[in-house]
Amino acid sequence: GSGIFQLRLQEFVNQRGMLANGQSCEPGCRTFFRICLKHFQATFSEGPCTFGNVSTPVLGTNSFVVRDKNSGSGRNPLQLPFNFTWPGTFSLNIQAWHTPGDDLRPETSPGNSLISQIIIQGSLAVGKIWRTDEQNDTLTRLSYSYRVICSDNYYGESCSRLCKKRDDHFGHYECQPDGSLSCLPGWTGKYCDQPICLSGCHEQNGYCSKPDECICRPGWQGRLCNECIPHNGCRHGTCSIPWQCACDEGWGGLFCDQDLNYCTHHSPCKNGSTCSNSGPKGYTCTCLPGYTGEHCEL
C-alpha cells in the first residue's frame, strides 16, 4: 500500500460494566473493538469500510489501559493500510463490543453485544505527529490517537510519490521527504546518472564516466584536458589546436626541426667574426682582417 492509517487505543473506561442497551455484562464486559475507516461523510452511514476495517482480540474487561504491542494478535497501534492517494479527509467508526466467546477471535463468536461506538469525521494530513482525542458518552470513555503515514518508498503529502534509493547504471540518488530525487555526491541530471567530472575538466575536450574523473578526448592531454597534443614529429614547436606544430622562434619546417638561427644556436664563427643566417642550417662567417677560413679559424 501507499500509506497506513494508524490508530492507537490508549484507555477504555466502562466502570459500571454496561452494554449500550442498558444491560450489564456478566461477569464483566470482555471488550474488543471493531474499527471501520471510510471516505469522508458529512453524516456517517452504514455500508462498506471503503478505506479498510480491522478487529482486535479481547483487550480487557470493563476498564483497562491498552499497551503498545508491535506484533502478533492485539497489535497496537492498529494498522489500516491503503493503496491510493490519501485524500486528506476520512470518517472513522470505533465500536467497543462485549464477547462471551473466544478471546483471540471474538469477531466470530455468537452473542456479541455492542458496548459503545464513536464516530470521527474530519481532515487529516499525512505526518508523523499523532492526533490525540478522547470521546465520552454517559457510560464509557475512550482515549486514542491516530495519524496517517506513508508506507516505505512512498512520499509526499498524499503518499502518492514513489521513490527508492538507487545506486547503479540507471541512477545514483536517494529520496527527499517530498519524494523528489536527491543525487548522491558526484552525480547530476534528472535521473542522477550524469557524473560530475573533476573540477576544471575542460567541457569540450574532457569527459568522465565516473565522478572526479577527467578523460581526454583525442588530441588533448593534461590533468584537465586543456593542453593540446602537437603533431607527432613536432620538435621545436607548440600547438593551440591538436596535431598542430607552430614553430618556436628560429625554427622552421613541417616538424619545426630545421634550424633557422644556426648562428645563435651554435656560434660557428670564430675570432670575433660576424655570423649571418642563410636558410635552414645555412650560415656565413664574415672574418675580421687577418683571419680566413669557413669559420674564420685560420
Epitope: 514513489l162 527508492k164 541512477g171 519524494g179 546518472d193 550524469q194
Partner: nanobody, 118 residues
C-alpha cells in the same frame, strides 16, 4: 506506461557481428537513460551497456571495445552494435528503461536471443 520491443538477435559465428534494436513506445524523453542487460542460461541477469542524458555511455568490462550502444531520440530507439562476438556472449539480451525514482518498477522488454557458435 512504457513498452519495449527488442529485435536483431540470432545465431552468429564467433568473431561475427549483430546489431540489436530496442524500440520504446510510450512516454520516453531524451533524458531517460536506456540500457541493455543479458542473461545466460543458469546465470543472473547482468548489465551490458547503458546510454544516458547527453549520450554518456557505460559498458561492462567484458564488452568494452567490442560493443557500442547508441540511441536515436527521434525514433525512441536504442541500439547495441556487437562486434567480435564470443561464445560467452550467448544470452537473452534485454532492453531496459528505469522507472523514475524506483528500481523495482523498471520497464523491461521481452528479450531477444543471441547465440554465438564456435
Amino acid at each position: 506506461q512504457v513498452q519495449l520491443q527488442e529485435s536483431g538477435g540470432g545465431l552468429v559465428q564467433a568473431g561475427g557481428s549483430l546489431r540489436l534494436s530496442c524500440a520504446a513506445s510510450g512516454n520516453i524523453s531524451v533524458w531517460i537513460p536506456m540500457g541493455w542487460y543479458r542473461q545466460a542460461p543458469g546465470k543472473e541477469r547482468e548489465f551490458v551497456a547503458s546510454i544516458g542524458e547527453g549520450s554518456t555511455t557505460y559498458y561492462a568490462d567484458s564488452v568494452k571495445g567490442r560493443f557500442t550502444i547508441s540511441r536515436d531520440n527521434a525514433k525512441n530507439t536504442v541500439y547495441l552494435q556487437m562486434n567480435s562476438l564470443k561464445p560467452e556472449d550467448t544470452a537473452v539480451y534485454y532492453c531496459a528503461v528505469p522507472y523514475y525514482g524506483h528500481s523495482d518498477y523498471d520497464y523491461w522488454g521481452q528479450g531477444t536471443q543471441v547465440t554465438v557458435s564456435s
